[in-house]
């Protein structure tokens, strides 16, 4: 053998010549092919392309390509097709994740909850309750909690403070004469701006992907009290109505602005596709379909001493 060795030098395998009993060192065949004729002491090995429905992933010294896995079982879809270089790989479609060898839909975070961690093809969505100053007004498996609309930046005032489930409602001040117009820092409301109302309908539930804290453990029961209590704000089931009354008494001429249709609204709903896994906490091993009647489907799948 020549002394020179290069990192990309083709590999070799050993083969016993049946005619002579000689142990020969032959060049491996490239990925996507197999050895159709072994080398002899006068001729190089011969490689042939893998027939349709078979593959070899690496350079090899094997006499037959591996059978591809069977077609993906519903509802899985093909991530990689069966080709000369690759086995068929199955994955869950967008919006679903691998669960017990099938696909389950991503958890939908209910109103008042947002996506903490996007779902992937191998992991479910993780939900979290919307923190102070944020809200989620639609059930979604892709939307994060959105920040309240900043009324002041639009030269508006907060008429109805946002909750975990609703945005701030902004409005305009009545026309004041120059002598009575409020100064920029003047408080307009008798109640704090981030007043939170916790009107949780009895139907509200916490799906398996939800967390009441930032930990990775998934809550499987409804939280005792929504996180505002943990944040130190006592829920007040009457505050919403009373607040509205107070506002209306104090500022009878306020105009309510439907900012969700106005040009300044920044909470436009966008449905985002589920992100593909780039190797997460769960197994990122590609899912294979069952093999076609080959006993080697079990442990050392496709292992061959002559294919590395």
């Amino acid at each position: 053998q020549p002394e020179q060795k290069a990192s990309n030098l083709i590999g070799t395998y050993r083969h016993v010549d049946r005619a002579t009993g000689q142990v020969l060192t032959c060049d491996k065949c490239p990925a996507g092919t197999y050895v159709s004729e072994h080398c002899t002491n006068t001729s190089l090995r011969v490689c042939s392309s893998c027939p349709v429905g078979t593959f070899t992933r690496h350079e090899n010294g094997i006499e037959k390509c591996h059978d591809c896995s069977q077609p993906c079982p519903w509802p899985m879809i093909e991530k990689l097709p069966c080709a000369a270089l690759t086995d068929r790989e199955c994955t869950c479609p967008p919006g679903m994740f691998q669960s017990n060898a099938t696909c389950a839909p991503h958890t939908v975070c209910p109103v008042g909850w947002g996506v903490r961690k996007k779902g992937t093809e191998t992991e479910d969505v993780r939900c979290k309750q919307c923190a102070r100053g944020t809200f989620s007004d639609v059930p979604s498996s892709v939307m994060k909690c959105k920040a309240y609309t900043d009324c002041l930046s639009q030269n508006l005032v907060v008429i109805k403070p946002g909750t975990k489930e609703t945005d701030n409602v902004c409005g305009t001040l009545p026309s004041f004469s120059s002598s009575t117009s409020p100064s920029p820092g003047t408080a307009i409301f008798p109640r704090p701006e981030h007043m939170e109302t916790h009107e949780v309908p009895s139907s509200t539930y916490v799906p398996k992907g939800m967390n009441s804290t930032e930990s990775n453990s998934s809550a499987s029961v409804r939280p005792k009290v929504l996180s505002s209590i943990q944040e130190g704000t006592v829920p007040d089931n009457t505050s919403s109505a009373r607040g509205k009354e107070d506002v209306n008494k104090t500022l009878p001429n306020l105009q309510v602005v439907n900012h969700q249709q106005g040009p300044h609204h920044r909470h436009i709903l966008k449905l985002l596709p589920s992100m593909e896994a780039t190797g997460g906490e769960k197994s990122s091993t590609p899912i294979k379909g069952p093999k076609r009647g080959h006993p080697r489907q079990n442990l050392h799948k496709h292992f061959d001493i002559n294919e590395h």
Epitope: Q1, P2, E3, Q4, A6, N8, L9, I10, D27, P30, S36, E37, C39, T40, N41, T42, S43, L44, V46, C47, S48
Partner: antibody, heavy 117, light 110 residues
Framework: EVQLLESGGGLVQPGGSLRLSCAAS????????MTWVRQAPGKGLEWVSS????????WYADSVKGRFTISRDNSKNTLYLQMNSLRAEDTAVYYC??????????WGQGTLVTVSS | QSELTQPPSASGSPGQSVTISCTGT?????????ISWFQQHPGKAPKLMIY???KRPSGVPDRFSGSKSDNTASLTVSGLQAEDEADYYC??????????FGGGTKLTVL
């Protein structure tokens, strides 16, 4: 002594055909792959085609694929090259060479093929 | 198949050494230690001088040696003699039973 003797070259018009032969002697022909190499006048060597010992597999340079066919008759110790649809650029000396594993260890003296109208 | 790259000419005085390079790619020279060198005198058939990078067939003087680094092979002729004046061709196996030749180097003994 290993000997390879090519024959069958000559003058042919564009689009015409020729069949080259290479008679092998002085060694056991059947275990060796065989190869045709050509050399245009004043130019370098160009690999043309190879065939495995059994004759069951053949390979061709892109420049001749679909027009040339390599074959062998192990009982006659002879290698062939059937050349169809000849072009001016096929004009060359054609050598047959014994292929010992990866290298051409013995060459014939060559036969000249001229494609011209 | 693109040919390997050789310098068109090389020269040296009798007794000197000269090295001819042959550059290919990772698909041919870089992938296999199957580099051969041929000597061809005008009007003659090529003669094998080196095979498998650095092996000499019987009958070839040990003044001829070969080497390879990455994608480049080299032929060195030391102690140049007048009869060494010829064309030299490198060739590399390129996989799939295909071979690629260099364009040839004309070696002149001054």
């Amino acid at each position: 002594e290993v000997q390879l003797l090519e024959s069958g070259g000559g003058l042919v018009q564009p689009g015409g055909s020729l069949r080259l032969s290479c008679a092998a002697s002085g060694f056991t022909f059947s275990p060796y792959s065989m190869t045709w190499v050509r050399q245009a006048p004043g130019k370098g060597l160009e690999w043309v085609s190879s065939i495995v010992p059994s004759g069951g597999k053949t390979w061709y340079a892109d420049s001749v694929k679909g027009r040339f066919t390599i074959s062998r008759d192990n009982s006659k110790n002879t290698l062939y090259l059937q050349m169809n649809s000849l072009r001016a650029e096929d004009t060359a000396v054609y050598y047959c060479a014994r292929t010992n594993l990866s290298y051409f260890d013995y060459w014939g003296q060559g036969t000249l093929v001229t494609v011209s109208s | 198949q693109s040919e390997l790259t050789q310098p068109p000419s090389a020269s040296g005085s009798p007794g000197q050494s000269v090295t001819i390079s042959c550059t290919g790619t990772s698909n041919d020279v870089g992938s296999y230690n199957y580099i051969s060198w041929f000597q061809q005198h005008p009007g003659k058939a090529p003669k094998l001088m080196i095979y498998e990078v650095n092996k000499r067939p019987s009958g070839v003087p040990d003044r001829f040696s070969g080497s390879k680094s990455d994608n480049t092979a080299s032929l060195t002729v030391s102690g140049l003699q007048a009869e060494d004046e010829a064309d030299y061709y490198c060739t590399s196996y390129a996989g799939s039973h295909k071979w690629v030749f260099g364009g040839g180097t004309k070696l002149t003994v001054l």
